[in-house]
């Protein structure tokens, strides 16, 4: 019952005498495993016996015994799905039908497979695309309906009997759907391949020829052309004649039209295979080719470069760049069309020949002002010398040169004078348009390049000017050498380094910051009284009476300058101490008595100490000692001591008398 068995395998397999056949096969028995398998050659059903007759190539039974002569045929399958077979070697008489007799526990089936074995290896088959065009990649396919694991083969491509360089891709298929060997070759045919024979050769593993297939290539291509020119080198002089001929070496399909092109542009009314140019001019120099078309497209010949030779044309000079800045580089180019190219150039600067300059370009790496002027050139080739033009002008721009600042005043200049300066220069390109002055000040510029300084300052030491065009050039600073009275006169204490104490040796210095001229005289004064004429004022032993306001004067030929008043302070210990009593030195008991410690001290007394007639210090430390109410027993002699940072001083004794009040006397 066919519904119980499902088989898949190729319908027909191909091989040749001595090769092998591999039969991929799968099956499914729906009612259980395979119990018996017989491979028949050309089986025929015998109705009488209800069995198949025919040559048994392979038999497998429940006991698993296989006839020993059947090793040529192998069943590579199993009991439930694989029915693959191999016959190795295969013989011519194996052609026909193979019958696979399958039996399970309850079902039987005969599956038929066709086997076609030829006497000699059959040829592969080459497949080509419907149209092949030059330079378009195509794939050539060589197919052979054979593949067997036990018999390796190879397919090789040949062009006109020579192995092709391109790499072919070979693939094999041994599946239940198909059995084949295929070789694919990717190939870009050129027009020269048209009509050539391509072969696919079947070879065994050792490269021995087995069979082949051949095809002739039909490569469609544009016309292939050759151009010939007279004269052959295509070099002529103006007025000569030139002939060009176009020849078609190949065209598939046949050509239809002819035309000529110069520098890629079609020449009108030139539609024959010959181009005649009479009395050529230099404008006819260029690249010529012929173009012939067919259904594929236009084909062009190689280009012929026609050179019409002529003497150099009138020359012009191009300057890169003018105006040029001094120090920059400049290049001059002599422009003169000529064929052949000029072999020699002569350069002129301001009408004079520039020696050693024979090239098309003149390069000056560092331009100087003297390079300015007219540059002209003349070009020369084998046909003659060109006309030399008037040339090109090089303008060299540079900052103002040799700038100087000049003082117009008579010398010397005194502080407060009006000073006039001018800014001079030697040359400039472009012209000077402005001037700058250093240092900046609120000064007048009455005219271009002139500076007026009203009431010149003592400190206007140097002035520099710059003359400016596109750049500024500074002159070296010029010294005004302004003369002035001594400046910044001040009194400075040289010794002692610390504060002045009574008895110290003291030196005062009269300082000034500057004076022009340098020669000076000094004067010291205190309270309008002249003390000395040296730069220093000295005290061997200073006393408090020397304290006061001091000034010094410094004068030169221009004038004199006084210092600010300087206060001389002398420090001394408390002196001239005395005790004063208020309301007096006799006080009635019960009243108030105030004792004051008076002194002269610098700095002032910072600390007071009081003592009684027993030299006993009292617990009071202020300048005033207040006794309230005063008692009779307060009577006695008192003294005080004053202390400052310099030292101590003491007063003489002062006696306080406290007398009894009338009340006390009355009680007695």
């Amino acid at each position: 019952d066919s519904s119980k068995w499902v088989f898949e395998h190729p319908e027909t397999l191909y091989a040749w005498e001595g090769a092998c056949v591999w039969i991929p096969c799968t099956y499914r028995a729906l009612d259980g495993d395979l119990e018996s398998f017989i491979l028949f050659h050309n089986p025929e059903y015998n109705k009488n016996t209800s069995k198949f007759d025919g040559t048994r190539l392979y038999e497998s039974t429940k006991d698993g015994k296989v006839p020993s002569e059947q090793k040529r045929v192998q069943f590579l399958g199993d009991k439930n799905k694989n029915c693959t077979l191999s016959i190795h070697p295969v013989h011519l008489n194996d052609s026909g039908q193979l019958g696979l007799r399958m039996e399970s526990k309850t079902e039987k089936w005969m599956e038929r497979i066709h086997l076609n074995v030829s006497e000699r290896p059959f040829p592969p088959h080459i497949q080509l695309p419907p149209e092949i065009q030059e330079s378009q990649e195509v794939t050539l396919t060589c197919l052979l309906n054979f593949s067997c694991y036990g018999y390796p083969i190879q397919l090789q491509w040949l062009l006109e009997g020579v192995p092709m360089r391109q790499a072919a891709v070979t693939s094999t298929s041994l599946t239940i759907k198909s059995v084949f060997t295929r070789s694919e070759l990717k190939f870009s045919p050129q027009w020269s391949h048209h009509g050539k024979i391509v072969t696919c050769q079947l070879q065994d593993a050792d490269g021995k020829f087995l069979s082949n297939d051949t095809v002739q290539l039909n490569v469609k291509h544009t016309p292939k052309l050759e151009i010939k020119v007279t004269p052959s080198d295509a070099i002529v002089r103006e007025g000569d004649s030139v002939t060009m001929t176009c020849e078609v070496s190949s065209s598939n399909p046949e050509y239809t039209t002819v035309s000529w092109l110069k520098d890629g542009t079609s020449l009108k009314k030139q539609n024959t295979f010959t181009l005649n140019l009479r009395e050529v001019t230099k404008d006819q120099s260029g690249k010529y080719c012929c173009q012939v078309s067919n259904d594929v497209g236009p084909g062009r010949s190689e280009e012929v470069f026609l050179q019409v030779q002529y003497a150099p044309e009138p020359s012009t000079v191009q300057i890169l760049h003018s105006p040029a800045v001094e120090g920059s580089q400049v290049e001059f180019l002599c422009m003169s069309l000529a064929n052949p190219l000029p072999t020699n150039y002569t350069w002129y600067h301001n009408g004079k020949e520039m020696q050693g300059r024979t090239e098309e370009k003149v390069h000056i790496p560092k331009i100087l002002p003297w390079h300015a002027g007219t540059y002209s050139c003349v070009a020369e080739n084998i046909l003659g010398t060109g006309q030399r033009g008037p040339g090109a002008e090089l303008d060299v721009q540079y900052p103002p040169k040799k700038v100087t600042t000049v003082i117009q005043n008579p010398m010397p200049i005194r502080e407060g004078d009006t000073v006039t300066l001018s800014c001079n220069y030697n040359s400039s390109n472009p012209s000077v348009t402005r001037y700058e002055w250093k240092p900046h000040g609120a000064w007048e510029e009455p005219s271009l390049g002139v500076l007026k300084i009203q009431n010149v300052g003592w400190d206007n030491t140097t002035i520099a000017c710059a003359a400016c065009n596109s750049w500024c050039s500074w002159a070296s600073p010029v010294a005004l050498n302004v003369q002035y009275a001594p400046r910044d006169v001040r009194v400075r204490k040289i010794k002692p380094l610390s504060e002045i104490h009574s008895g110290n040796s003291v030196s005062l210095q009269c300082d000034f910051s500057s004076s022009h001229p340098k020669e000076v005289q000094f004067f010291w004064e205190k309270n309008g009284r002249l003390l000395g004429k040296e730069s220093q004022l000295n005290f061997d032993s200073i006393s408090p009476e020397d304290a006061g306001s001091y000034s010094c004067w410094v004068n030169n030929s221009i004038g004199q300058t006084a210092s600010k008043a300087w206060t001389l302070e002398v420090l001394y210990a408390p002196r001239r101490l005395r005790v004063s009593m208020s309301p007096g030195d006799q006080v009635m008991e019960g009243k108030s008595a105030t004792l004051t410690c008076e002194s002269d001290a610098n700095p002032p007394v910072s600390h007071y100490t009081w003592f009684d007639w027993n030299n006993q210090s009292l617990p009071y430390h202020s300048q005033k000692l207040r006794l309230e109410p005063v008692k009779v027993q307060h009577s006695g002699a008192y003294w005080c001591q004053g202390t400052n940072s310099v030292g101590k001083g003491r007063s003489p004794l002062s006696t306080l008398t406290v007398y009894y009040s009338p009340e006390t006397i009355g009680r007695r």
């Epitope: 301001n350 007219t374 002008e393």
Partner: antibody, heavy 118, light 116 residues
Framework: EVQLVESGGGFVKPGGSLKLSCAAS????????MNWFRQAPEKGLEWVAY????????YYADTVKGRFTISRDNAENTLFLQMTSLRSNDTAMYYC???????????WGQGTSLTVSS | QLVLTQSSSASFSLGASAKLTCTLS???????IEWYQQQPLKPPKYVME???????STGDGIPDRFSGSSSGADRYLSISNIQSEDEAIYIC?????????????FGGGTKVTVLG
């Protein structure tokens, strides 16, 4: 409008000197090379001298070399021709001419007449 | 030596076309030349510059009737629809700087007469 006005011509004895001037207007004088041409009575034109824009290049015809001096003042837009050691064959109409392009003598003055005679 | 050759005179009918020739010395056939017009008692007037390839540029105020062309060493001045005011001497000139010397050479001039 381009204008070139020559002046300074006149009568002079052989061996004498004279200075011709040409006042230019209507164009940037310093951008052009300038020439002096002359034309003797009933004769053809003759180039005399050339001066470049910036006075860098100066040329003279062989017939006047060493006797004539061409100069210009770009600030004043004026061209000069100082003539010394004058000869009778220097007698001519003298033209001040602007040069443009290659050698295009594109503007000519009306001319000033010089007669050298004893 | 740089030489310009012109025919001395030519006559043309009013309204006709005139073509004047100026021939350069053979070794100077690539040179640019200039054409000038000189009327009696007047200074020369610049007409045009003509190059070897026939291209030309006319001076200010020159009518379109004037054109230039070239062939080999010949330079041409053409006047179409010639007018009586075109009657003048036409002189060609050429400049060159040879070595360290400038030269400006004139042709002999062609005297043009307009008839009718």
């Amino acid at each position: 409008e381009v204008q070139l006005v020559e002046s300074g011509g006149g009568f002079v004895k052989p061996g004498g000197s004279l200075k011709l001037s040409c006042a230019a207007s209507g164009f940037t004088f310093s951008d052009y090379g300038m020439n002096w041409f002359r034309q003797a009575p009933e004769k053809g034109l003759e180039w005399v001298a050339y001066i470049s824009r910036g006075s860098h290049t100066i040329y003279y015809a062989d017939t006047v070399k060493g006797r004539f001096t061409i100069s210009r003042d770009n600030a004043e837009n004026t061209l000069f021709l100082q003539m010394t050691s004058l000869r009778s064959n220097d007698t001519a109409m003298y033209y001040c001419v602007r040069m443009a392009g290659y050698y295009a003598m594109d503007y000519w003055g009306q001319g000033t007449s010089l007669t050298v005679s004893s | 030596q740089l030489v310009l050759t012109q025919s001395s005179s030519a006559s043309f009918s009013l309204g006709a076309s005139a073509k004047l020739t100026c021939t350069l010395s053979s070794q100077h056939s690539s040179y640019i030349i200039e054409w000038y017009q000189q009327q009696p008692l007047k200074p020369p007037k610049y007409v045009m510059e003509v190059k070897k390839d026939g291209s030309h540029s006319t001076g200010d105020g020159i009518p379109d009737r004037f054109s230039g062309s070239s062939s080999g060493a010949d330079r041409y001045l053409s006047i179409s629809n010639i007018q009586s005011e075109d009657e003048a001497i036409y002189i060609c000139g050429v400049g060159d700087t040879i070595k360290e010397q400038f030269v400006y050479v004139f042709g002999g001039g062609t005297k043009v007469t307009v008839l009718g």
